[in-house]
């Protein structure tokens, strides 16, 4: 399986909310043995590979912000923890899977990575990640809704496996 | 914050199977993984194995035989048993939270378990 | 299973010095490697994650290298608190298995 950023770039007003999104391409193991572990984190794009290092989101871990659940079935996070931060991860039964954050700031301008961790017991952990930029913008250049930008054609899916 | 507590008997009997709880504060054990690690006395880390929340299994191939891990999230508590024990199972035992494609990052203080008659 | 080795089972330093230590894997592991870090009495405490990434709260002086069977992990200037033992740990696949150890000790 692969993960794809439908959007590379999100450019949002402050104050406005915005849901980033990662899809889970190709065939998922549904087996009794596999199950799937999801979330976000903020990274930077390092010299050795993008989204290796995890930073929280709003003073959020990546522990706190994760899914968890077998195949494509539905979830979301802790909703106390998450939406006192107004923050919500959620995940949908056709392998879309979200972060919204609601009232954004300066300070939420950065990348972000969706990780997707399929579990295969007794084997190993297949890892895939996505990345996506957004930036919150403040003043008279700022637009009046979050604007979003396809990934490019030539890496349209913005897939990175690992 | 998460904080892990074992307990169990300090003194197990050779041949005697080797009884330990682990208990999750602070958390919800509804996810991750959650390992068994032991240590003998100056001497390295071995992996045991894990449960998931999901109530999957794996362990250590060199255990497998002797191996039970379970978990009753009800008490949110995880439990080892390790049967037919001998003096090599003298250890420092640890459990653990281990993150799906990341680490070990939360650990119990450990509980030291002497196999003797 | 894999096979860490680390190297050399002690290192004699002083305080302010640079501790280089090194962990081997018998076949690669991409860079899913973790470094710990245990001193006597306690359990063992997470310092890097990913071959070079520091967990939360650890200091800049400890930092991590490496990819493939070849690992590093440097403290730049040793201070008092950071003579211990320190363990890498792989998870390309199951079992998890540790090194043997690097124990840092005061010269």
């Known amino acids: 399986f692969k993960v794809a950023t439908p959007y590379s770039l999100y450019v949002c007003p402050e104050g406005q909310n915005v849901t980033l999104t990662c899809r889970l391409l190709g065939p998922v193991d549904k087996g009794h043995d596999v199950t799937f572990y999801k979330t976000w984190y903020r990274s930077s794009r390092g010299e050795v590979q993008t989204c290796s290092e995890r930073r929280p989101i709003r003073n959020l871990t990546f522990q706190d912000l994760h899914l968890h659940h077998g195949g494509h079935q539905a979830a979301n996070t802790s909703h106390d923890l998450a939406q006192r931060h107004g923050l919500e991860s959620a995940s949908d039964h056709h392998g879309n899977f979200s972060i919204t954050m609601r009232n954004l700031t300066l300070l939420d301008s950065g990348l972000y990575c969706c990780l997707v961790v399929e579990i295969r017991h007794h084997h190993s952990e297949h890892r895939v990640h996505g990345a996506m930029e957004l930036q919150v913008q403040t003043g008279k250049d700022a637009p009046s809704n979050c604007v979003v930008y396809p990934s490019s054609s030539q890496d349209s899916e913005n897939i990175t496996a690992a | 914050q998460v904080q892990l507590q074992e307990s169990g008997p300090g003194l197990v009997k050779p041949s005697e199977t080797l009884s330990l709880t682990c208990t999750v504060s602070?958390?919800?054990?509804?996810?991750?993984?959650w390992s068994w690690i032991r240590q003998p006395p100056g001497k390295g880390l071995e992996w045991i194995g894990y449960?998931?929340?999901?109530?999957?299994?794996n362990y250590n191939p060199s255990l497998k035989s002797r191996v039970t891990i379970s978990v009753d999230t009800s008490k949110s508590q995880f439990s080892l048993k390790l049967s037919s024990v001998t003096a090599a199972d003298t250890a420092v035992y640890y459990c653990?939270?281990?993150?799906?494609?990341?680490?070990?990052?939360?650990w119990g203080q450990g509980t030291m378990v002497i196999v003797s008659s | 299973e894999i096979v860490l080795t680390q190297s050399p089972a002690t290192l004699s330093l002083s305080p302010g010095e640079r501790a280089t230590l090194s962990c081997r894997a018998s076949?690669?592991?991409?860079?899913?490697l973790a470094w710990y870090q245990q001193k006597p009495g306690q359990a063992p405490r997470l310092l890097i994650y990913d071959a070079f990434n520091r967990a939360t709260g650890i200091p800049a002086r400890f930092s991590g290298s490496g990819s493939g069977t070849d690992f590093t992990l440097t403290i730049s200037s040793l201070e008092p608190e950071d003579f211990a033992v320190y363990y890498c740990?792989?998870?390309?696949?199951?079992?998890?298995?540790f090194g043997g150890g690097t124990k840092v000790e005061i010269k």
């Open positions: 602070g958390g919800s054990i509804s996810s991750y993984y």
């Open positions: 740990q792989h998870r390309i696949n199951w079992p998890l298995t």
């Open positions: 449960i998931y929340y999901s109530g999957s299994t």
């Open positions: 076949q690669s592991v991409s860079y899913y």
């Open positions: 653990a939270r281990d993150i799906p494609a990341f680490a070990f990052d939360i």
